[in-house]
């Protein structure tokens, strides 16, 4: 069977939504009303990996696009990017590790930890209109907590 994928949107803990910023970057900003239609819809795939009640391995693709969030080393630093893939081969149950995030939910907080780089998380800045990035600190200035809204296909 193919991998099960469900559509969802994400907001950070300050209620900023995620939108496209150019072809290969996401940014976080506050949206209201009809502007909410700009927010990115992810296709979240439940992939192979170590799993527990609080931790589920997922891949985050952009709905109806052959783009996936991935984690790679750039200048020796773990970095978040949008990577183009062959739509004939993705998504799949055994995703390469750079595409895999541990979706961790504890006490109303939802985090996305890179499977490739443990303790590095999908992050947003406090400031408006800044890129979504991979951050190596929790509980600091940068935001690593999200809420998820599943949406019908």
């Amino acid at each position: 069977a193919p991998v099960r994928s469900l559509n969802c949107t994400l907001r950070d803990s300050q209620q900023k939504s995620l939108v496209m910023s150019g072809p290969y970057e996401l940014k976080a900003l506050h949206l209201q009303g009809q502007d909410m239609e700009q927010q990115v819809v992810f296709s979240m795939s439940f992939v192979q990996g170590e799993e527990s009640n609080d931790k589920i391995p997922v891949a985050l693709g952009l709905k109806e696009k052959n783009l996936y969030l991935s984690c790679v080393l750039k200048d020796d630093k773990p970095t978040l990017q949008l990577e183009s893939v062959d739509p004939k081969n993705y998504p799949k149950k055994k995703m390469e590790k750079r595409f895999v995030f541990n979706k961790i939910e504890i006490n109303n907080k939802l985090e996305f930890e890179s499977a490739q780089f443990p303790n590095w998380y999908i992050s947003t800045s406090q400031a408006e209109n800044m890129p979504v990035f991979l951050g190596g600190t929790k509980g600091g200035q940068d935001i690593t907590d999200f809420t998820m809204q599943f949406v019908s296909s």
């Epitope: 099960r4 559509n7 939802l110 809420t147 296909s153």
Partner: antibody
Framework: EVQLVESGGDVVQPGRSLRLSCSAS????????MSWVRQAPGKGLEWVAY????????YYPDTVKGRFTISRDNSKNTLFLQMDSLRPEDTAVYYC????????????WGQGTLVTVSS | GIQMTQSPSSLSASVGDRVTITCRAS??????LTWYQQTPGKAPKLLIY???TLAEGVPSRFSGSGSGTDYTFTISSLQPEDIATYYC?????????FGQGTKLQIT
């Protein structure tokens, strides 16, 4: 023994609001995703709201999106459904059920509470 | 979304009979299928998940099979307590939807 006990059902006028509660016992509530499923009189089942075990994930089908809000208080083992702008077609028995998006099925159900929307 | 169609909508059978209910999905649901039993005036009860896995405490006379879009629920030997309405439900893609139900009566 797992127990889910719903309350809050009532007769309300169209356009009004109602809040349902579900008290859970017999399992570790904070470890389970929860849902509300409704059944109109003499009809089938419809899933109307979902919340993840910690409360950070939610889902609503288009029929109730923007009108219903699901929430939970894990410290009190209680699930809620806030229903606003009620319509006659929302008339149903509302069941609290254990399960949701990830597991996909509902393995424990409450006895239901009746909501009637009528002028 | 994916629609679930159950057949028949109602049926009568005798104690000891083998009873079969079918559920057809409007698209492939890859065995992400559940069956529930709802006895009159009661809440639904989970019987089968993942198309063929029996839920805890469910008698072995109940079984499920099928693949792709077509699934079958079987009671090998009907008992009086099986009088109920049976529902299928898929959980492949959102929204997860239920079939319209099959009402089972004893002749």
């Amino acid at each position: 023994e797992v127990q889910l006990v719903e309350s809050g059902g009532d007769v309300v006028q169209p356009g009004r609001s109602l809040r349902l509660s579900c008290s859970a016992s017999g399992f570790i509530f904070s470890k389970y995703d929860m849902s509300w499923v409704r059944q109109a009189p003499g009809k089938g089942l419809e899933w109307v709201a979902y919340i993840s075990h910690g409360g950070a994930g939610t889902y609503y089908p288009d029929t109730v999106k923007g009108r219903f809000t699901i929430s939970r208080d894990n410290s009190k083992n209680t699930l809620f459904l806030q229903m606003d702008s009620l319509r006659p077609e929302d008339t149903a028995v509302y069941y609290c059920a254990r399960g949701g998006v990830y597991k996909g099925y509902f393995d424990e159900w409450g006895q239901g509470t009746l909501v009637t929307v009528s002028s | 979304g994916i629609q679930m169609t159950q057949s028949p909508s109602s049926l009568s059978a005798s104690v000891g009979d083998r009873v079969t209910i079918t559920c057809r999905a409007s698209g492939n649901i890859y065995d992400y299928l559940t069956w529930y039993q709802q006895t009159p005036g009661k809440a639904p009860k989970l019987l089968i998940y993942n198309a063929k896995t029996l839920a805890e405490g469910v008698p072995s006379r109940f079984s499920g099979s099928g693949s792709g879009t077509d699934y079958t629920f079987t009671i090998s030997s009907l008992q009086p307590e099986d009088i109920a309405t049976y529902y299928c439900q898929h959980f492949w893609t959102l929204p997860y939807t239920f079939g319209q139900g099959t009402k089972l009566q004893i002749t």
